[in-house]
């Protein structure tokens, strides 16, 4: 049975700044044919037929739902891309994480400007700080890591705060063992 394709992002962030670039790739097994991929953005068929969809110099209109389809195989699960204009943007490797999987958070500065005194917050409480910009890495996410995250930092000597981001950690499905 052909499996559903999956859309991946490179860089892996689904929240990006206006003007940045991101490549969406439609991954699946046994998809050999060139120009056989359909891309859907907010339900509309895109002109792109390659397995990779390049978004260059992202605009607000690039925000929304992306899905891909190989041949007549089922459509992929949707991936949501959001384009922002702000001083700081909290980016996450995923907004819904399976328990036991890694979670990475990044406090991204507009135009890649240096950000100092970066503090990450979870549910309103300071989680970690450092003098320069830094990432948060949770190697094995647990349900307790679910919450609302944001970051603060200094850009050009002024204090800024990112928009909050909800992270949900879901329990891994238990394998079913059937008695013979």
């Amino acid at each position: 049975v052909p499996q559903k394709p999956k859309v991946s992002l490179n860089p892996p962030w689904n929240r990006i700044f206006k003007g940045e670039n991101v490549t969406l790739t439609c991954n699946g097994n046994n998809f050999f044919e060139v120009s056989s991929t359909k891309w859907f953005h907010n339900g509309s068929l895109s002109e792109e037929t390659n397995s990779s969809l390049n978004i260059v110099n992202a605009k607000f209109e690039d925000s929304g739902e992306y899905k891909c389809q190989h041949q007549q195989v089922n459509e992929s699960e949707p991936v949501y891309l959001e384009v922002f204009s702000d001083w700081l943007l909290l980016q996450a490797s995923a907004e819904v994480v399976m328990e036991g999987q890694p979670l990475f958070l990044r406090c991204h500065g507009w135009r890649n400007w240096d950000v100092y005194k970066v503090i990450y917050y979870k549910d309103g409480e300071a989680l970690k700080y450092w003098y320069e910009n830094h990432n948060i890495s949770i190697t094995n996410a647990t349900v307790e890591d679910s919450g609302t995250y944001y970051c603060t930092g200094k850009v050009w000597q002024l204090d800024y705060e990112s928009e909050p981001l909800n992270i949900t950690v879901i329990k891994a499905p238990r394998e079913k063992y059937w008695l013979q």
């Epitope: 005194k117 300071a126 970690k128 003098y131």
Partner: antibody, heavy 120, light 111 residues
């Protein structure tokens, strides 16, 4: 009152192991980095390393990397500095100190110091 | 990482002002607005007197002030008093892996 209380003076022989401690009081121990500083007799301050008790993220000075181990037990608000094999040159006063916090740069609360004497 | 350079000693009469310099490079003092200063009396633990280049903890006298220009940071003690006699150390951020490097230390003598 915010304070750091260090373990007592130690007299050891060369080649022995040692673990000294630094316990935090009066604040949320997991929310500030804790640094360790060496001061050899009659000499200046040397930064050894720093740990974030919240997740045990640790950074070492190149001069001390591989020579000592910094750790923390957040359940008892305590940071540690340990040696697996002491040398006579490890004879010094060792201080733990709390980072100001929130990305501000400085060490605002210091322990009273632990004197380590190593004889060869 | 080399220690920051401070004068070995500085002296002044009561009531005078003295300035202690702390010289680094563009990789430490010159590269970041992260400098702190410490006072250490004999047999005592160091005490923070300046953080973030110019900021003073609330309990520290306003006779202590600090600044930075290029690769050099400076600590000024005005209205020098007998209790200011101590060793003074600067510190600067150098990198994410080595956030603290101390100065060589300056002995302040009140004449």
């Amino acid at each position: 009152e915010v304070q750091l209380v260090q373990s007592g003076a130690e007299v050891k022989k060369s080649g022995e192991s040692l673990k000294i401690s630094c316990k935090g009081f009066g604040y949320t121990f997991t929310r500030n980095w804790i640094g360790w500083v060496r001061q050899m007799p009659g000499k200046g301050l040397e930064w050894m390393g720093i740990i974030y008790p919240g997740d045990s993220d640790t950074r070492y000075s190149p001069s001390f990397q591989g020579q000592v181990t910094i750790s923390a037990d957040k359940s008892i608000s305590t940071a540690y500095l340990q040696w697996s094999s002491l040398k006579a040159s490890d004879t010094a006063m060792y201080y733990c100190a709390r980072d100001v916090g929130n990305g501000d740069y400085g060490l605002d609360v210091w322990g009273q110091g632990t004197t380590v004497t190593v004889s060869s | 990482q080399s220690a920051l350079t401070q004068p070995a000693s500085v002296s002044g009469s009561p009531g005078q002002s003295i300035t202690i310099s702390c010289t680094g490079t563009s990789s430490d003092i010159g590269g970041y607005d992260f400098v702190s200063w410490y006072q250490q009396h004999p047999g005592k633990a160091p005490k923070l007197i300046i953080y973030d280049v110019t900021r003073r903890p609330s309990e520290i006298s306003n006779r202590f002030s600090a600044s930075k220009s290029g690769n050099t940071a400076s600590l000024t003690i005005s209205g020098l008093q007998a209790e200011d006699e101590a060793d003074y150390y600067c510190s600067s951020y150098t990198s994410s892996s080595t956030p603290y490097v101390f100065g060589t230390g300056t002995k302040v003598t009140v004449l």
